[in-house]
Structures are given as structure tokens and as C-alpha cells.
Amino acid sequence: GRLVHMTVVSGSNVTLNISESLPENYKQLTWFYTFDQKIVEWDSGKSKYFESKFKGRVRLDPQSGALYISKVQKEDNSTYVMRVLKKDGYEQEWKIKLQVLDPVPKPVIKIEKREDVDDNCYLKLSCVIPGESVNYTWYGELPKEIQNSVLETTLKPHKHSRCYTCQVSNSVSSKNGTFCFSPPCTAARSEQKLISEEDLGGEQKLISEEDLHHHHHH
């Protein structure tokens, strides 16, 4: 049995098919999920759809053997098997391992630590999303690309704000969160606040009280 891997985003419509031609004049074609749970069977020129969680959202194309599934969900994660009974009476099978992933949510950036160290500003940020297995990448004025959920950096004294973007991604989607930092390091003169992504057109920022006031008056 040949095994093909497919990763798709939840809610999408999926086509399960094989990359080769079906055996000529086959007698029967059946799609299963797991070993022996039937979804649909084509026999004697007719398609029979079985009572299963897929009923009403699958369609078989007997010509190509393709199985169309609408609105896949994470619960549809499975190995799908297409078995064909050939005209010589022998069975042939193909397997597709389907992984359905939810789109990643927008990340939340948390300030873990912020302190003065020898006139420089030590900053530790974490990029948080709820219970997901994802990849992280930080972008900004950094010495090297950082590929984990925590960013640690030391900033030399500066007058302008610095922004750091955390990108979270899985194989079907990616989302960004941006943190903008305005001096001073320890907010003695002005308290810095976090503004939601919605407020800032999809970006998440930490800005000064002054900026906040200005932002809300626009």
C-alpha cells in the first residue's frame, strides 16, 4: 500500500486522490477511514454512501477514484484507504494520511522581564498562543534570527521606538504579533501599555502613555 501524506487547514474542502490511473475496468472501489470503516463504495455502476460521520459531506468520482470531503475538521485526522477490486479478482490499495490543522491564532506577546543593565536595556519577551504545536520566528533589529517562543535582547540607549514581530506558523497558516518598545527601559516617567491587535489594525504593541493618548485622539 502506497502512503501519501496530506496536511490541510480545518474548514477547507479536500480532494483525496491517487497520482496514478485506476486499474482498468475495476469491479469495485471502496474508500475507508482507518482499516475497515467504509465511507463510500462503488459497485455495479452505483455509489453507496455508508452511515458514517462523513455522510452528506463526501462525494466519489468513480472515474478518477477521487473522494471529495467538504469542511474537514480536526476529528477527520485519519489514514484513508482506497481499495480497488481489479477485474482479475485481486485487490489493490492506496493510503492517504490526512492531517487537519486549525489556523494558528494571533499570538500574544508578554513582557517577561525589562531592566536596566549597565545603561543598556535588557528585554525578555515571550510569544504565547494557546496549546498549539507551532514554529516561532522573531523579526526586528536582532543580531540573528530567533526561532523559539522567547526573545531576549539587550538594547543600547535609543530615542526611537523599536518593534519586534513574532510570527507563529504551522504548515497551513501563520499569524504575526508585534511589540513596539519606547524608551525609557524602566518606565519611571511614563507607563507603557499593551494595546490589542484590533485597536492597532491587527498589530499588538506596547506603547507609552503619551502614544496611547495620541492614538485614541485619532
Partner: antibody
């Protein structure tokens, strides 16, 4: 007429191994999934393992997973069950059965007795 | 997994009597994917009924099956001497396939 004939059973010590065979005739063997079902003395039927017609997919009961291996040789019309790390609770008559259209078991062989005892 | 419970465990009857065997599933068996088997002492099981109510090839019409969802019945309209045996139900609506524990029909 479809016929299934099991062999290979016998007495084995706990931790030992056995290989059961099932010779099939009277149908296109490679077109059908096959199964092993067992029955402990005086007890009910317990499905053990399944294999697709092509041999490309296998499936096991939790009680035997990692210890039993089902395989087939379609050129010899023969089904096998390799059993290792045998336990007393594996003692049973082992039947091979044609897994009719991936639904029910029909027909069955006459069975072969496996006894695991020290 | 679906658990099948058969009742009664044993039935003591005489030839000519009508028999009703019950098989109850722990959850609904989709599309009545239920089979019945007969097993005589020292023999392999034999398929009697599939799809809850369809008789297998060569099975006499005194055997009939009915039911859906969680409750299924095997009826033998008139017991013949060769019908004394153990009867098992099996569901094939979900994986793994499971069997009931059996009902023994013995001579009174």
C-alpha cells in the same frame, strides 16, 4: 467451495513463539481481507487481527498489539499469524476467517489449538 | 468500542419450540451492521444472518433476524434437533469488530 485450513498450533511455554498458517482455496485469495479470531476454552469469540486483500494494511486487537504479526502470501494462498512473547491468556483455538467485504466473517476454518503453559 | 450483551446466557428448550435470542449494543450500531453466528461443539462458527435481517447462503428460513439501533433479535421459528448450539452476535458498524458473549440453546 471455499475452504480454510489452519495449522501450526501446539503447546508452548510462556514467552515462547508460534507461527500459525491458514491455507485457502476455492476463491481469489488476494481479493479478500482475512482475519484471525480466537476462542479460549469454554469462552466466547475474540477478534485478534485483520489484513487487507493486498496485505498493505493490518489491524490488531489491543491485547495482542506488538506481539502478534499478521501477514499473507497471495502467491501461496496462505495467511499467517506470527505470535511471540506468548502468555497463558493467549491459550485458545485460533480460527482464520474470510473477512467478507470488510464486514463479517464468512466462512471460518476448523481452527487450531494453541496452549501456553509451563 | 461497542459492547454487545446477549441474553439469556442459556436457554433450555425442546425441539419444535420457538426461540428468541437478544443482543443489545452499548451504543447504536449504524445501518444495522449486525451478524449472527451459530457454533456447535467442536466446530467453527457459521454465519447465519448479516445486515441484522439477511439470511446467509444455505441458511434455512426458520432463522430470522430483526432489530436496529441497539436492540437486535435472532428468532428460530421452530427448533430442530440440529439447532442446539451456541449463538453469537457481532457488530461491524464500527472498529474494532466485537462479539457478544454468546447464548447457549440446550435441549430441555
Amino acid at each position: 467451495e471455499v475452504q480454510l485450513l489452519e495449522s501450526g498450533g501446539g503447546l508452548v511455554h510462556p514467552g515462547g513463539s508460534l507461527r500459525l498458517s491458514c491455507a485457502a482455496s476455492g476463491f481469489t485469495f488476494g481479493g479478500y481481507a482475512m482475519s484471525w479470531v480466537r476462542q479460549a476454552p469454554g469462552k466466547g469469540l475474540e477478534w485478534v487481527s485483520l489484513i487487507s486483500g493486498s496485505g498493505g494494511s493490518t489491524y490488531y486487537a489491543d491485547s495482542v498489539k506488538g506481539r502478534f504479526t499478521i501477514f499473507r502470501d497471495n502467491s501461496k494462498n496462505t495467511l499467517y499469524l506470527q505470535m511471540i512473547s506468548l502468555r497463558a491468556e493467549d491459550s485458545a483455538v485460533y480460527y482464520c476467517a474470510k473477512y467478507s467485504n470488510y464486514d463479517y466473517f464468512d466462512p471460518w476454518g476448523q481452527g487450531t489449538l494453541v496452549t501456553v503453559s509451563s | 468500542e461497542i459492547v454487545l450483551t446477549q441474553s439469556p446466557g442459556t436457554l433450555s428448550l425442546s425441539p419444535g419450540e420457538r426461540v428468541t435470542l437478544s443482543c443489545r449494543a452499548s451504543q447504536s450500531v449504524s445501518s444495522s451492521y449486525l451478524a449472527w453466528y451459530q457454533q456447535k461443539p467442536g466446530q467453527a462458527p457459521r454465519l447465519l444472518i448479516y445486515g441484522a435481517s439477511s439470511r446467509a447462503t444455505g441458511i434455512p428460513d426458520r432463522f430470522s433476524g430483526s432489530g436496529s439501533g441497539t436492540d437486535f433479535t435472532l428468532t428460530i421459528s421452530r427448533l430442530e434437533p440440529e439447532d442446539f448450539a451456541v449463538y453469537y452476535c457481532q457488530q461491524y458498524g464500527s472498529s474494532p469488530r466485537t462479539f457478544g458473549q454468546g447464548t447457549k440453546v440446550e435441549i430441555k
